[in-house]
């Protein structure tokens, strides 16, 4: 993410552009894109960005819609950077267990887990 | 995940076992495992389960610690199932845009984005 625009501001601007250009983006009535069927979004980043790629290739570029896809490309880069940070630091088992506990805690409280 | 234990109950039980067996799990003082340095846990599921594998191979099995690793294996399976559901359904662009908007909205409100 370039230092001149923080990730949080980038996300906000992208949300606004997405809303503005919705009718332009849905112009292709026949296009079908894979949509995840659960709300644990972070698990699906690859599929989301593949979908964005499909959409971009089908959308007439120009003006601020170009800005939208540029932003989405920067967000993809940011997430790629975050994914890199998943395995960069080798630490004691204590600290790994802390992370695992946090992960399970988040699963326990924030994940949408369908009942079986 | 077997139908006899819902995922949410499994996660709760695993958290309790993790706490109980902490000293057993950190018995190898020299072992180092990659620990993600941000809190967007779902981005790091692969690395987390690789770490669990490393830990399991270094831990003396038996008793309820075996139950802990069995549970973690079931959670991994559950997450694998969720990842599969990321690309199963092909939908209209409107629905993809709805999902993208939710994803960015979650990024905007819930992700831990470091300031640059």
């Amino acid at each position: 993410i370039p230092t001149e625009i923080p990730a949080s501001a980038l996300v906000k601007e992208t949300l606004a552009l997405l809303s503005t250009h919705r009718t332009l983006l849905i112009a292709n009535e026949t296009l079908r894109i894979p949509v995840p069927v659960h709300k644990n979004h972070q698990l699906c980043t690859e599929e989301i960005f593949q979908g964005i790629g499909t959409l971009e290739s089908q959308t007439v570029q120009g003006g601020t819609v170009e800005r939208l896809f540029k932003n989405l490309s920067l967000i993809k880069k940011y997430i790629g950077g975050q994914k890199k940070k998943c395995g960069e630091e080798r630490r004691r088992v204590n600290q790994f267990l802390d992370y695992l506990q946090e992960f399970l805690g988040v699963m326990n409280t924030e994940w949408i887990i369908e009942s079986h | 995940i077997p139908t006899e234990i819902p995922a949410s109950a499994l996660v709760k039980e695993t958290l309790a076992l993790l706490s109980t067996h902490r000293t057993l799990l950190i018995a190898n003082e020299t072992l180092r495992i990659p620990v993600p340095v941000h809190k967007n846990h779902q981005l790091c599921t692969e690395e987390i389960f690789q770490g669990i594998g490393t830990l399991e191979s270094q831990t003396v099995q038996g008793g309820t610690v075996e139950r802990l690793f069995k549970n973690l294996s079931l959670i991994k399976k559950y997450i694998g199932g969720q990842k599969k559901k990321c690309g199963e359904e092909r939908r209209r662009v409107n629905q993809f845009l709805d999902y993208l908007q939710e994803f960015l909205g979650v990024m905007n409100t819930e992700w831990i984005i470091e300031s640059h």
Partner: antibody, heavy 119, light 106 residues
Framework: QVKLLQSGAALVKPGDSVKMSCKAS????????IHWVKQSQGRSLEWIGY????????VYNEKFKSKATLTVDKFSSTAYMEFRRLTFEDSAIYYC????????????WGQGVMVTVSS | DTVLTQSPALAVSPGERVSISCRAS??????MHWYQQKPGQQPKLLIY???NLASGVPARFSGSGSGTDFTLTIDPVEADDAATYFC?????????FGGGTKLELK
């Protein structure tokens, strides 16, 4: 209520050794690490190291590696620290403290052992 | 070793808000804990992992920060809060403590 009861004050000569104890009660001793911390007169705190009562494994601050030896007796739920080749700089209060588990904060502390090195 | 720098002393009146800072010489993610020590007593855990309130500690105490800059806040300060406050990190070996901040009440 978790308690860590430490042994009494010690007056020792330079070059001698001292072994202090820390008796834990009201929790499962083998489920939490025990740390040792030094506090010199009017000074800050220094982490000496910890022992895992489950395995007997230890992690030391490099600075204290040749000075301190940490051990445990699981049956009496007691942790020990032996400090050897004492010098005047070793005069301090020594605390044992329980590790709280998640993120390893020191959640319960003993009352401290005052060690005075004097010839 | 990771050096933790705290200002040596602060003086506040009861009822005021006070912030005690701790700056680390290198990044610690959120592995910072805070302790209170009164004269003649052992330290007492207040905050663990930067922002989590330890069991039995009044909600007047709070912690914030990540990376290299951390803060312990007491709001409002009470007469009983006169003590020395230590920060401690355990992200890097060896674990280290700050020099302590002595909080005096006016």
């Amino acid at each position: 209520q978790v308690k860590l009861l430490q042994s009494g004050a010690a007056l020792v000569k330079p070059g001698d050794s001292v072994k202090m104890s820390c008796k834990a009660s009201d929790y499962t001793f083998t489920e939490y690490l025990i740390h040792w911390v030094k506090q010199s007169q009017g000074r800050s705190l220094e982490w000496i190291g910890y022992i895992n009562p489950y395995s007997g494994g230890t992690v030391y601050n490099e600075k204290f590696k040749s000075k301190a030896t940490l051990t445990v007796d699981k049956f009496s739920s007691t942790a020990y620290m032996e400090f050897r080749r004492l010098t005047f700089e070793d005069s301090a209060i020594y605390y044992c403290a329980r590790d709280g588990g998640y993120s390893d904060p020191l959640d319960y502390w003993g009352q401290g052992v005052m060690v005075t090195v004097s010839s | 070793d990771t050096v933790l720098t705290q200002s040596p002393a602060l003086a506040v009146s009861p009822g005021e808000r006070v912030s005690i800072s701790c700056r680390a010489s290198e990044g610690l993610t959120s592995y910072m804990h805070w302790y209170q020590q009164k004269p003649g007593q052992q330290p007492k855990l207040l905050i663990y992992k930067a922002s989590n309130l330890a069991s039995g500690v009044p909600a007047r105490f709070s912690g914030s920060g990540s990376g290299t800059d951390f803060t312990l806040t007491i709001d409002p300060v009470e007469a009983d809060d006169a003590a020395t406050y230590f920060c401690q990190q355990n992200w890097n070996d060896p674990w280290t403590f700050g020099g302590g901040t002595k909080l005096e009440l006016k």
